[in-house]
Structures are given as structure tokens and as C-alpha cells.
Interface confidence: low
């Protein structure tokens, strides 16, 4: 236990604290009667050098003076920044068993200097809040620093706050605790911060402001907005702000935007009106406050204010197509579709859609509102016919959209030409295609039409479409385009009262199918052989099927299949072949290939023909 | 009120580029599609590009040569026309749309034009 030194004192030249690279002597004397019994010749002092509380050295080499049995001095050079430990204990020789005493110790701290603060900032937050500065201390002295704030003003206004560094605190800012009013605006005042330690002192330059300089205003609060009129696009901006506050930056944006709206007011008094918001779009505000035009800082952001800014009435052209169907000699189903307005053309939750349809010469009229995107009616087929659709919101409806509903497919003079289907990636397929060679009339648009060739996808699911300029003649289809799916792409050409169409199957990715077709019967008639099949299931497609193979042979043949390539229609699934000999027993199955290859084979089914051979 | 001003018009050689600018007022500009038209000496005037939301449509004759971007900060529409070939000759005008496509009867308000002239 060094902090009871009985047996003697340790004492340090030329101080306890020292510059950096310096050299101390350190000594280490016995108080008088103390020392190993009867024999003080044998004292034997020795200094021991810890670090963080571990030994690090004997220092018993570096004794410069030894009075034999009362004292010695050692001397110690490169010590290291910080503080080191040294414990000075009394060996006596004669006795070996016995492990040295301890007499004393001293701590030896190693620093530098402060330098002069630099880069000093006062701010006070606030009419009524309190001055505080904070600087640069510069490198670190690992001694234990005291910092004084200074401020001196107006007045004989004289103010001072201390505060301390050492290993455990960092001190580089201190409140005055003092408030400036804004009827000291033009005054000027000055700090300095005085650095002192063991080792010496220092002073920054003295730093000089006013009180525009260094008061940042509370960021404005209470933020409100009033929409006039119950208006979607203007609307008052209202806040609270300090008093002195002569101008404002106000930033807004749409919730889901990146990009802020931003906007300077002088004297708005906490009122501001905006005149460019979207309707029906959730929007964030916040304001920031200045007290000064030209000079000051811009107070914090506040608070976000968060409001949703309310509807005004659609605006826009709905997007409408549709489908015809005969029922019977004279009906027809008319199914009406259109897309959804985006929501910078609705501005506001669409409740429903108004959607009329008119004979033109007749003028009847049928009339219906719908909140779906589709609407099927059963009219007449005779007479011409148009269709308009508009959407409604709470606060009105947008202008209606008119098509004219003419035979699609019609006019054979209005089909495109050599169209194609090309899949581009996993989910979009190139469609191109040439204008009608002898139109009679001129193309006002093409429509581009696909839907998936699965089961029930007519009555299911309703059409996609994308609208093209007279004069493009491709189109990048993508919505809804599924990989290993095939669709049928229509392309139509519409004049003012006629349609041409053709067809044609595609997709954006493709595999040989799972499964070839199941044979479900032969039939045998007029020499020929009937094969009967049921199409493979739509999800083992995989793609659109380009044809069907039908192979044979004799049942022990080892010989190759024959085969009959048949081009895929979706409506067929039966096919002749006449080349099989009579009484001869024939294994015969099919598979189906798509762009990627062909299927494994489907089911086989043994057929002896019974007629004679052709 | 109003205004649709087209600029950065010009004579330039085949295969060379030019930038037209459309710069909008009086209206609120994020609402609206945005279309480039022309109109050559005797021909109809017909539809270039346009940029309705997320997407961007050219004609056919254009796609890989034309781009059309807009600013809503700065409420401007572009048309960046490179390799110009001598029959893009023709004025350029700037339209925008509560909703249409690429039908000029659509476009609510038009700017005045700006000639573009490609010789070869």
C-alpha cells in the first residue's frame, strides 16, 4: 500500500509533471530508524515502474546517487504521454526469503502544453434562450485543462464560465447562461477561451458577433394548412413563430416524391398560400424561420406536418376498348372496358363510372353507372353505335371519353399485315406488324390486344390493350406478360367506322412442354384413320405450341416412327393419316413442340386398322 | 394565362443534334402529359413524342434517334433530336394534356413552334 509511506518519502525533480521528452530524477529515502533490523548497510532501495497497474521495469541500472542504506536516486527518460506509476521498496539482502517492502510512490504525469483554441461558435436557440460557445481545444494535453469562457460587451457586460479536460471529460463548450434581447441587435460582442494547465497556457483570439449572428431562431411550430373552398390545389399554410422572425423557407413535397417543393417568405406574418398542390396527394410540410434578411442562420426544420389535400373533379381521357359478340341473329353482346385514370387525372378516390351507350340514328340510349372498369350490355345488332365513359369522384366527373363501336375484325381490307410476335425478355414480347395494303379508309389507330390462351380466359379475364399512332407499326406489350404463358396478340386497325384484325400467338419465354397430348380414341372410316386427343393442360404448355407431331410404327418394329406434323389450332383435336397397312397392330402416340422443343410423348395406344391400304 | 414557349431550334447538317426546350407557364405543370408535334411544309401535323406519367412514347421513325424528359421543378419538357436527319425538317411544336395520347385533337394548349432545319 503505497499511500501509507511510513518507512520513508518519494519525491520527484524536477515535478510531478513534465513536458513531453523530458527526464525526472526520482528519490527514494528511508525515514530515520527505519530499514532492515541492525544491519542499515544492507538496505537495498529499488524503483519499480508500473503502467496501467502493470510492472513494466526494475529501474534498479538507472540509480545516478546511492547514500548506502538511506537513500537513492534514479533517473528516468522517455516516458510516454499520460501518467506512470512509480513504487520505490526496500530490498533487505540478507534475508532472501523475504520479499521487498514497499516505502513509497509518486505519480509522474507526461503531457504538452494546450495549443490556442481556435474555431470558437456562439449560438444562442431562440429570443429567450442562453449563450453557448463551443471551439477547437486543439491536441490533446493528457493533463487535466482548465477552459475559461469570456464574453465582454455593451456596458461594461462582462461574463466568464470554466470547465476542465482530463482523461475522464472532454471540456470544448460551455453555456454563459445568459440571454441577449434583440434591443442589443447591433451591439457587438467578444469572447475569448483561456486554456491553462501545468505545463503552461494559452489564449485563442478574441471572437466577435452580434446578435443576429449567433441567435437561431426555435423552428416554427403549430403548423396548420386550410385548404380554401375545400380546394385540391390551394391552400393556406399557417404557423407560429418568434416574434422577431422577418422571413421563412417553406419545403413541401408529395410523400412519395424525392424531390422537395422549396419556397422563400418575407414577412408572412405565419401565413403563407399555395397554389400548385396536387389534389387527393399526401404531402409534407415543414418551415424553417430567419430573423435577419441577409444575415442570421435559418432555424432547424420544423416539425412535418402531414395532410392529405382533398379531391377535385377527374380530369383526363379514359383509356376505353371493348368487345363484340353476336348472340343471335339480331343481338349482340357488347362488353365496354377501359383502364384506371392515374392519380394525378382522378384526384380524388373514383366511386364510380357513367357510361352510356347510344344508337346514333335512333337515339336510344342506355344509361348505368358501375364502380368496376367493365360493363357488359346486350343491344341490338343492327345500327351504329357509340360508347362514352367518365369518372366520377365526391366532386364531380371528368369530361366522357366516346369510341365508336364498329365490327373489329370486319373489314378484311383493314387487316395488318405480316404481323409478328417476338419475345424480347421473361416478361415482354415485341409485336410488329405492317399497315393494310388496299384500306379504303385511313387508319385513325391501331389497338394492340392480348389476352392468355387459357381456359375461360375470354369470360374471366378482361382484355389488355395498348393504344398506337397511325404511323408506328410496333409495340412493346408488357403488362400482365407472364414467362412460359402463351397469349393471343391481336392487332387492329381502326378507321372512323370500320376494323380490320389479325392474329396471332406469342410469348415472352418458352420451354418444351411437360407432357405431349393424350390419345383418346382411333376411329377407323372410309380407310382412314381418325386420331383423337385431348390438348395438354395449359400450365404444362409452357409456351405457345407451335405443332402437334402424331408417330407410328408396328408394334415389335424396331424400326423409326413414322410421322405427321400438324400445325396447332386451338379448335382442332382430331387429325386423319392414311398410310397405315391393314390387320398390322401399330403403337402410335404424339407430343407437342414449342419454340423450345419438343414434349416427351404423350400416352400410346395400339391400333390394328381393319380396311384395305391405300 | 397559358404560355408554351418553345426554344433551341435551328439549321444543323445531317447527322448532328439539337435540343429543344419547352418551357410552361400559367398552368400546373406536373398534371400534364406532355407531347412533342411537327408539322413539315404540306404535311399534316403529326405526333413525334410524348410522355404521359411513366411512359414515354416516339414515333417509330424517331425511337433510338429522339428522348424526350422533363423537369417539373423548372416546368419544362425536352426533346433531345440526335443523328437529325433531313427529313426531321419541319416545326417542332410542344403540346400538354389533362389526359391525351398522341392524337393532337387531344392537347389542350400549344406553343407557337420552333423551326428545325436539316440540311444534308
Known amino acids: 500500500n503505497i499511500d501509507v509511506c511510513k518507512l520513508g518519502t518519494v519525491t520527484v525533480q524536477p515535478a510531478p509533471v513534465i513536458p513531453l521528452g523530458s527526464a525526472a530524477n526520482i528519490s527514494c529515502s528511508l525515514n530515520p530508524k527505519q530499514g532492515c533490523s541492525h544491519y542499515p548497510s544492507s538496505n537495498e532501495l529499488i524503483l519499480l515502474k508500473f503502467v496501467n497497474d502493470v510492472l513494466v521495469e526494475n529501474l534498479h541500472g538507472k540509480k545516478v546517487h546511492d547514500h548506502t542504506g538511506h537513500s537513492s536516486t534514479f533517473q528516468v527518460t522517455n516516458l510516454s504521454l499520460g501518467m506512470t506509476l512509480f513504487v520505490c521498496k526496500l530490498n533487505c539482502s540478507n534475508s532472501q526469503k523475504k520479499p521487498p517492502v514497499p516505502v513509497c510512490g509518486v505519480e509522474i504525469s507526461v503531457g504538452v502544453a494546450p495549443e490556442p483554441p481556435q474555431n470558437i461558435s456562439c449560438v444562442q436557440e431562440g429570443e429567450n434562450g442562453t449563450v453557448a460557445c463551443s471551439w477547437n481545444s486543439g491536441k490533446v494535453t493528457y493533463l487535466k485543462t482548465n477552459y475559461t469562457l469570456q464574453l465582454s460587451g455593451p456596458n461594461n457586460l462582462t461574463c466568464q464560465k470554466q470547465c476542465f479536460s482530463d482523461n475522464r471529460q472532454n471540456c470544448n463548450r460551455l453555456d454563459l447562461g445568459i440571454n441577449l434581447s434583440p434591443d442589443l441587435a447591433e451591439s457587438r460582442f467578444i469572447v475569448r477561451v483561456t486554456a491553462i494547465n501545468d505545463l503552461g497556457n494559452s489564449s485563442s483570439l478574441p471572437h466577435t458577433f452580434t446578435f443576429l449572428d449567433i441567435v437561431i431562431p426555435l423552428p416554427p411550430w403549430d403548423i396548420r394548412i386550410n385548404f380554401l373552398n375545400a380546394s385540391g390545389s390551394r391552400g393556406t399554410l399557417q404557423w407560429e413563430d418568434e416574434g422577431q422572425v422577418v422571413l421563412n423557407q417553406l419545403r413541401y413535397q408529395p410523400l412519395n416524391s424525392t424531390s422537395w417543393n422549396m419556397v422563400n417568405a418575407t414577412n408572412a406574418k405565419g401565413k403563407y398560400d399555395l397554389r400548385d398542390l396536387r389534389p387527393f396527394t399526401e404531402y409534407e410540410f415543414q418551415i424553417s424561420s430567419k430573423l435577419h434578411l441577409s444575415g442570421g442562420s435559418w432555424s432547424n426544420w420544423s416539425e412535418s406536418l402531414r395532410t392529405r389535400t382533398p379531391e377535385e373533379e377527374p380530369v383526363g381521357i379514359l383509356d376505353i376498348w371493348y368487345m363484340k359478340q353476336d348472340i343471335d341473329y339480331d343481338r349482340q353482346q357488347i362488353s365496354l372496358f377501359w383502364k384506371s385514370l392515374n392519380p394525378s387525372e382522378a384526384r380524388g378516390k373514383i366511386l364510380h363510372y357513367q357510361v352510356t351507350l347510344q344508337e346514333v340514328t335512333k337515339k336510344t340510349t342506355l344509361q348505368n353507372t358501375t364502380r368496376h372498369t367493365s360493363w357488359t350490355r346486350v343491344i341490338p345488332r343492327t345500327g351504329a353505335w357509340t360508347a362514352s365513359v367518365s369518372a366520377a369522384n365526391s366532386k364531380g366527373a371528368s369530361a366522357p371519353t366516346h369510341i365508336n363501336i364498329v365490327d373489329l375484325c370486319g373489314t378484311g381490307l383493314l387487316a395488318p399485315h405480316q404481323v409478328s410476335a417476338k419475345s424480347e425478355n421473361m416478361d415482354n414480347i415485341l409485336v410488329t406488324w405492317q399497315p393494310p395494303k388496299k384500306a379504303d379508309s385511313a387508319v385513325r389507330e391501331y389497338i394492340v390486344e392480348w389476352r392468355a390462351l387459357q381456359p375461360g380466359s375470354i369470360t374471366k379475364f378482361p382484355p389488355h390493350w395498348l393504344r398506337i399512332p397511325p404511323d408506328n407499326m410496333s409495340a412493346l406489350i408488357s403488362e400482365n406478360i407472364k414467362p412460359y404463358i402463351c397469349y393471343e396478340i391481336r392487332v387492329h386497325a381502326l378507321s372512323e367506322s370500320q376494323g380490320g384484325c389479325s392474329s396471332i400467338r406469342g410469348d415472352s419465354k418458352h420451354k418444351a412442354p411437360v407432357s405431349g397430348p393424350h390419345i383418346t380414341a382411333i376411329t377407323e372410316k372410309k380407310e382412314r384413320l381418325f386420331i383423337s386427343w385431348t390438348h395438354i393442360p395449359f400450365p404444362e404448355q409452357r409456351g405457345c405450341i407451335l405443332h402437334y407431331r402424331i408417330y407410328w410404327k408396328e408394334r415389335d418394329s424396331t424400326a423409326q416412327p413414322e410421322l405427321c406434323e400438324i400445325q396447332y389450332r386451338r379448335s382442332q383435336n382430331s387429325h386423319p393419316i392414311s398410310s397405315l397397312q391393314p390387320r398390322v397392330t401399330y403403337v402410335l402416340w404424339m407430343t407437342a413442340v414449342t419454340a423450345a422443343g419438343e414434349s416427351p410423348q404423350g400416352n400410346e395406344r395400339e391400333f390394328c386398322p381393319q380396311g384395305k391400304a391405300n | 394565362q397559358v404560355q408554351l414557349q418553345e426554344s433551341g431550334g435551328g439549321l444543323v447538317q445531317a447527322g448532328m443534334s439539337l435540343r429543344l426546350s419547352c418551357a410552361a407557364s400559367g398552368l400546373t405543370f406536373s398534371w400534364y402529359r406532355m407531347g412533342w408535334f411537327r408539322q413539315a411544309p404540306g404535311k399534316e401535323r403529326e405526333f413525334v413524342a410524348g410522355w404521359y406519367g411513366v411512359l414515354t412514347q416516339y414515333r417509330d421513325s424517331v425511337k433510338g434517334r429522339f428522348t424526350i424528359s422533363r423537369d417539373d421543378a423548372k416546368n419544362t419538357v425536352y426533346l433531345q433530336m440526335n443523328s437529325l436527319k433531313p427529313e426531321d425538317t419541319a416545326v417542332y411544336y410542344c403540346?400538354?394534356?389533362?389526359?391525351?395520347?398522341?392524337?393532337?385533337?387531344?392537347?389542350?394548349?400549344w406553343g407557337q413552334g420552333t423551326q428545325v432545319t436539316v440540311s444534308s
Open positions: 403540346a400538354a394534356s389533362l389526359g391525351g395520347n398522341y392524337r393532337s385533337y387531344e392537347y389542350d394548349y
